[in-house]
Structure formats: C-alpha cells, structure tokens
Interface confidence: low
C-alpha cells in the first residue's frame, strides 16, 4: 500500500501520529475493533509528552487505551513492550479488582479523570482514542 503522509479528516496530527477522539462510549473490544476498521489501533502511550497530549484532548473523562491483560500479561495492542515502556498507573493500580460484581477481574486499561491509568472491566462503555502512525503503509490501494 501507499504511505500515509497526512491525517484523515477529523483526526489530529501530533508527532508523526494521527489521533481520533471519540465522543461516545463503547466496550473495549468494540472500541478496539472500531480503530482497526479505521486502519488504526487504540492509542499506545509511549512518553510523558504523548500522555499530556492525549490528556489535553480527552479531558477528565474515562477513556480506553490500547493496553490490556486479557491473556495474562499486560500488552499494548501494537506490540510495544509493556515492561520497558512508559507507564502512568494510579497508585495501587492495576489491581485486577473482583469486587465489582460483574464477573471476573479488570483486564483493560483506561485514562481516569486525572489522566492516570486504571484497570477496569472491559465491558464498560467508555470513550476511546484511536491512533495511527504517519509514514506507515496504508491498507488502501494507491490511486492510479
């Protein structure tokens, strides 16, 4: 495919990535699928600077990111290494809390009202952020 050199309409460019900020809520899996259908992924936060950028745009609202531990260890959806990467958990989090009464623990990460991360039940209908990198090959065929 061709390389994407500018962001799609209604996406925000920042540091060679494009971001789309939802204004409605979906379960984590549905949000993940939405981003994939846009040839993107749920946002992967790799630095303080990116954390602040996203936080500025989402405000004090619970918002899904591309981090989960549904298969055991914490993983970023784009393969970024979790152990050596940036982390912004609230103190005492993640705690895989079982006391919510919804069955199971908490396997999906979201931004909380102050920007810090929390793990929560993946079925909760939170807003979400999609991200795609500029200069990566687009899935769309090139124009002839």
């Amino acid at each position: 495919g061709s390389e994407r050199t500018c962001c799609p309409v209604n996406w925000v460019e920042h540091e060679r990535s494009c971001y789309w900020f939802s204004r409605s809520g979906k379960a984590w899996a549905d949000a993940d699928n939405y981003c994939r259908l846009e040839d993107a992924h749920l946002v992967v936060v790799t630095s303080w600077e990116e954390q602040k950028f996203v936080q500025h745009h989402i405000g004090p609202v619970n918002t899904w990111m591309g981090l989960h531990d549904q298969n055991g260890p914490w993983k970023w959806v784009d393969g970024t290494d979790y152990e050596t990467g940036f982390k912004n958990w609230r103190p005492e989090q993640p705690d895989d809390w079982y006391g919510h009464g919804l069955g199971g623990g908490e396997d999906c990460a979201h931004f909380t009202d102050d920007g810090r991360w929390n793990d929560d039940v993946c079925q909760r209908p939170y807003r979400w952020v999609c991200e795609t990198e500029l200069d990566k090959a687009s899935q769309e065929p090139p124009l002839l």
């Epitope: 982390k87 912004n88 103190p91």
Partner: nanobody, 120 residues
Framework: EVQLLESGGGLVQPGGSLRLSCAAS????????MMWVRQAPGKGLEWVSD????????YYADSVKGRFTISRDNSKSTLYLQMNSLRAEDTAVYYC?????????????WGQGTLVTVSS
C-alpha cells in the same frame, strides 16, 4: 552520584502553611518526573504528589488535593511542595524522589526527608 536534599520542614499549627524544597544534583533534573512521598509515624510510605519533567503535568493524592501545590524550577534543579491548610494528619517525614524514566509511579532515588509536624 544522585543526591536529593529536602528542606523546609518544621512545626506548624493546624491551618498553617509550609513550603518544602528539594535540591537535586547528579542527574539531568529537567528530564525526569519528580514526586513527593511521605511517611507518617508508624505508617508506610504514602504518595503525595508528582510532576512531569517540564512541570506542566501535576498529580495529587485525594488527601492533599486543593491544599498542596507541587512545582519545580528546572533552571535551579529544585522541586517544591507548597502545603496550605495543614492538618494533624499531614504530620510525617516528607521525601522527594526521582521517578524512573519509564514510569510515573515508581521511583529509584529519594532524599533523607524533612519532618513536618502539625500540632497546636
């Protein structure tokens, strides 16, 4: 060698104010998040507040939100904690700490602490 030297603690009456300082050396201060933690008598370490490397991202524990303000002066390699409306439960040894580069929760160096006593 990383060094963090806290100062500014002391005895203050309930409702009073103090400003803690932390002078840092031995590392590039402007590249790291910094935090304040405290340890009350007979208790464990409690996170109080922290601040992004450029000073624009600040976070507070619920117990101090609206009363404490964290700030930093990168030109002086100094971290501050302005503490207002102090309460007896704020009595503790306050430590400044250098955050690890890949985390805003973990720290790898901390100072010797400064004692804050809130009592009438």
């Amino acid at each position: 060698e990383v060094q963090l030297l806290e100062s500014g603690g002391g005895l203050v009456q309930p409702g009073g104010s103090l400003r803690l300082s932390c002078a840092a050396s031995g590392f590039t201060f402007s590249r790291y998040g910094m935090m304040w933690v405290r340890q009350a008598p007979g208790k464990g370490l409690e996170w109080v507040s922290d601040i992004a490397p450029d000073g624009r991202g600040t976070y507070y524990a619920d117990s101090v939100k609206g009363r404490f303000t964290i700030s930093r002066d990168n030109s002086k390699s100094t971290l501050y904690l302005q503490m207002n409306s102090l309460r007896a439960e704020d009595t503790a040894v306050y430590y400044c700490a250098k955050m690890m580069p890949t985390s805003t929760v973990s720290f790898d160096y901390w100072g010797q602490g400064t004692l804050v006593t809130v009592s009438s």
